[in-house]
């Protein structure tokens, strides 16, 4: 289905690499869905290039994308979410390249938010909680979350926990005492829908208590 234009006016265009990638976000604004596409080569001259999606749409045959700087964007209720759509890069009426994509396989969840960590002195642990807008959604409800944390001084030494819950307990004895930790979380679809990791949540920072010398336990902050 994908092909390059053969029109003589487009000879220069044919030399360029018009490969692109897209992600969908379902129920991102009430019942509206969004689709975002961008060229993989940041140096492509996008001046006269447009994106169009056709097929697997409700009530219409095709929709045109809006251009927002270097990305192309649609917000609509008209995605059927059954079957594949044809997404094409166009110059005027000529298609330069097309991809057949099932929008349910390129879902990028919204980033988790309200990440926080509470120390429980009696339990000697830290309860990590966060929120996700997907708990309220009709479609993409089942997610896997990736909670990543590190001691702030260990720049690349992240520990990851993959889980479905929005609550996680970190045992105090697994963490260094009197240390500053950074923690963040992201999400990916994990049932029926497929796709990509969300953006990371904003990081949350917390400090572990000192060790109390007499008992060998950490002091609460």
């Amino acid at each position: 289905e994908s092909g390059y234009a053969q029109n003589g006016d487009l000879e220069d265009a044919e030399l360029d690499d018009y490969s692109f990638s897209c992600y969908s976000q379902l129920e991102v604004n009430g019942s509206q869905h969004s689709l975002t596409c961008a060229f993989e080569d940041p140096d492509v001259n996008i001046t006269n290039l447009e994106f169009e999606i056709c097929g697997a749409l409700v009530e219409v045959k095709c929709l045109n994308f809006r251009k927002l700087q270097e990305i192309y964007f649609i917000e609509t209720k008209k995605f059927l979410l059954i079957g594949k759509s044809n997404i094409c890069v166009k110059v005027g009426e000529k298609s330069l390249t097309c991809k057949k994509i099932d929008l349910t396989t390129i879902v990028k969840p919204e980033a988790p938010f309200d990440l926080s960590v509470v120390y429980r002195e009696g339990a000697n642990d830290f309860v990590v909680t966060f929120n996700t807008s997907h708990l309220q959604k009709k479609y993409v409800k089942v997610l896997m979350h990736d909670v990543a944390y590190r001691q702030e001084k260990d720049e690349n030494k992240w520990t990851h926990v993959n889980l479905s819950s929005t609550k996680l307990t970190l045992l105090q004895r697994k963490l260094q005492p009197a240390a500053m930790y950074e923690i963040k979380v992201r999400s990916i679809p994990d049932h029926y829908f497929k796709g990509f990791w969300s953006e990371w949540s904003p990081s949350y920072y917390f400090r572990t208590p000192e060790i109390n010398n007499s008992s060998g336990e950490m002091d609460p902050i």
Partner: nanobody
């Protein structure tokens, strides 16, 4: 207390198949991603396969891709590894583990798989 008990290992000829099981307790199985790792004689731990909490995402080491299949039964709180077209280099102790980075503290006692004619 997290408990992971692997079973299903044994001696098998090259080209044969095995199905490993890992029964779990002490944590909410449905909440966590899980993985299989293995340790060949004299070698370090090698990651084998990963499965997400709902089972929608799986991933495999290149060395086992197309031959091994990871799955889970959340109702039975059990993890599985189906191993087909086994090779002598698959000989190792296989451990199931929670999908956390810290495999050393979150794995079972292992089950021995020996591939030999």
């Amino acid at each position: 207390q997290v408990q992971l008990v692997e079973s299903g290992g044994g001696l098998v000829q090259p080209g044969g198949s095995l199905r490993l099981s890992c029964t779990t307790s002490g944590f909410t199985f449905t909440t966590y991603a899980m993985k299989w790792v293995r340790q060949a004689p004299g070698k370090g731990l090698e990651w084998v396969a990963f499965i997400s909490p709902a089972g929608g995402i799986t991933d495999y080491a290149d060395s086992v891709k197309g031959r091994f299949t990871i799955s889970r039964d959340n109702a039975k709180e059990t993890l599985y590894l189906r191993m087909d077209s086994l090779k002598p280099e698959d000989t190792a102790v296989y451990y199931c583990a929670r999908g956390d980075s810290d495999t050393n503290n979150n794995r079972g006692q292992g089950t021995q798989v020996t591939v030999s004619s």
